[in-house]
């Protein structure tokens, strides 16, 4: 499934993300523009054998299971395949562990370069929440 | 078929501003990312900065922090790129250049014509 | 600031020639690794994206692998239309930075 913006906050909201961890809603869904474009089945496969999975590119070495990545470590205990859901529920809980893990949210490159520091909250103007 | 075209070719004194434009066609405007790189005669790429037109807020290199302004028009599908007190080593060739997929590689797909910006007294 | 440094800075060859470039960082990138090539007079033109996707339309003679901080551009056989420098890009953190290019000139 490929979200429209304000439908996205709204799911992420309602999934307990505004103010996770001190991030903004905002900050989910401009993560979430430039990891995967909204696409809940976005997939890349990394140089390394692993793959990013879903609308949040959840790392198949660290974070979910595959099949295919060796030495994965599996640490949100779901298989790869649940981050493609169009049921945002298992990205969500999923990425909770991750921004608790120590680095917050620059564990995502694309959040580092694309939104940490903007004005964040513009991805969630004009949308009711 | 993406098009970007930019303005013409300009020459300016030392210390001066010039603004440069790039007008997309062709594809969605609004929601990608369009970034400016430069390249000095016989020299690399070097990228100074990126806006996102839907939002307008832009985001630049730190080396040209505080000497460049990009903007972006939406509803003239135009990307602009200002920068001030030129010196001789501004003079270049400025692209314009859009995101590409997937996002989080940030490439870049398409790219303007360039536009020869020369510094001279 | 990561620096990204290619090997060769030029080199000569034939066509039909196999031509391998090489592009480091100064930091490990993961597979945020782009290449572009660039012919007299135009813009850059994307090749490879996450350091080893072909972008569509660009011929299966171009290829990338590489991981962390070292990263390959081949030509499986180099073509009369090859003949352009080819610049890395990476886009790990900002601000994003390139090579300083190589240039594929005719032996």
């Known amino acids: 499934k490929v979200f429209g913006r304000c439908e996205l906050a709204a799911a992420m909201k309602r999934h307990g993300l505004d103010n996770y961890r001190g991030y903004s809603l905002g900050n989910w869904v401009c993560a979430a523009k430039f990891e995967s474009n909204f696409n809940t089945q976005a997939t890349n496969r990394n140089t390394d054998g692993s793959t990013d999975y879903g609308i949040l590119q959840i790392n198949s070495r660290w974070w979910c299971n595959d099949g295919r990545t060796p030495g994965s470590r599996n640490l949100c205990n779901i298989p790869c395949s649940a981050l493609l859901s169009s049921d945002i529920t298992a990205s969500v809980n999923c990425a909770k562990k991750i921004v608790s893990d120590g680095n917050g949210m620059n564990a995502w490159v694309a959040w580092r370069n694309r939104c940490k520091g903007t004005d964040v909250q513009a991805w969630i103007r004009g949308c009711r929440l | 078929q993406v098009q970007l075209v930019q303005s013409g070719a300009e020459v300016k004194k030392p210390g001066s501003s010039v603004k440069v434009s790039c007008k997309a066609s062709g594809g969605t405007f609004s929601s990608y990312g369009i970034s400016w790189v430069r390249q000095a005669p016989g020299q690399g790429l070097e990228w100074m900065g990126w806006i996102i037109p839907i939002f307008g807020t832009a985001n630049y290199a730190q080396k040209f922090q505080g000497r460049v302004t990009i903007t972006a028009d939406e509803s003239t599908s135009t990307a602009y790129m200002e920068l001030s007190s030129l010196r001789s080593e501004d003079t270049a060739v400025y692209y314009c250049?859009?995101?590409?997929?997937?996002?989080?590689?940030?490439?870049?797909?398409?790219w303007g014509q360039g536009t020869l910006v020369t510094v001279s007294s | 600031d990561i620096q990204m440094t290619q090997s060769p800075s030029s080199l000569s060859a034939s066509v039909g020639d196999r031509v391998t470039i090489t592009c480091r960082a100064s930091?490990?990138?993961?597979?945020?690794l782009n290449w572009y090539q660039q012919k007299p007079g135009k813009a850059p033109k994307l090749l490879i994206y996450a350091a080893s996707s072909l972008q569509s339309g660009v011929p299966s003679r171009f290829s990338g692998s590489g991981s962390g901080t070292d990263f390959t551009l081949t030509i499986s056989s180099l073509q009369p239309e090859d003949f352009a420098t080819y610049y890395c890009q990476q886009s790990y953190s900002t601000p994003l930075t390139f090579g300083q290019g190589t240039k594929v000139e005719i032996k």
């Open positions: 930091q490990s990138i993961s597979s945020y």
């Open positions: 250049a859009r995101d590409g997929n997937p996002f989080r590689y940030w490439p870049f797909d398409y």
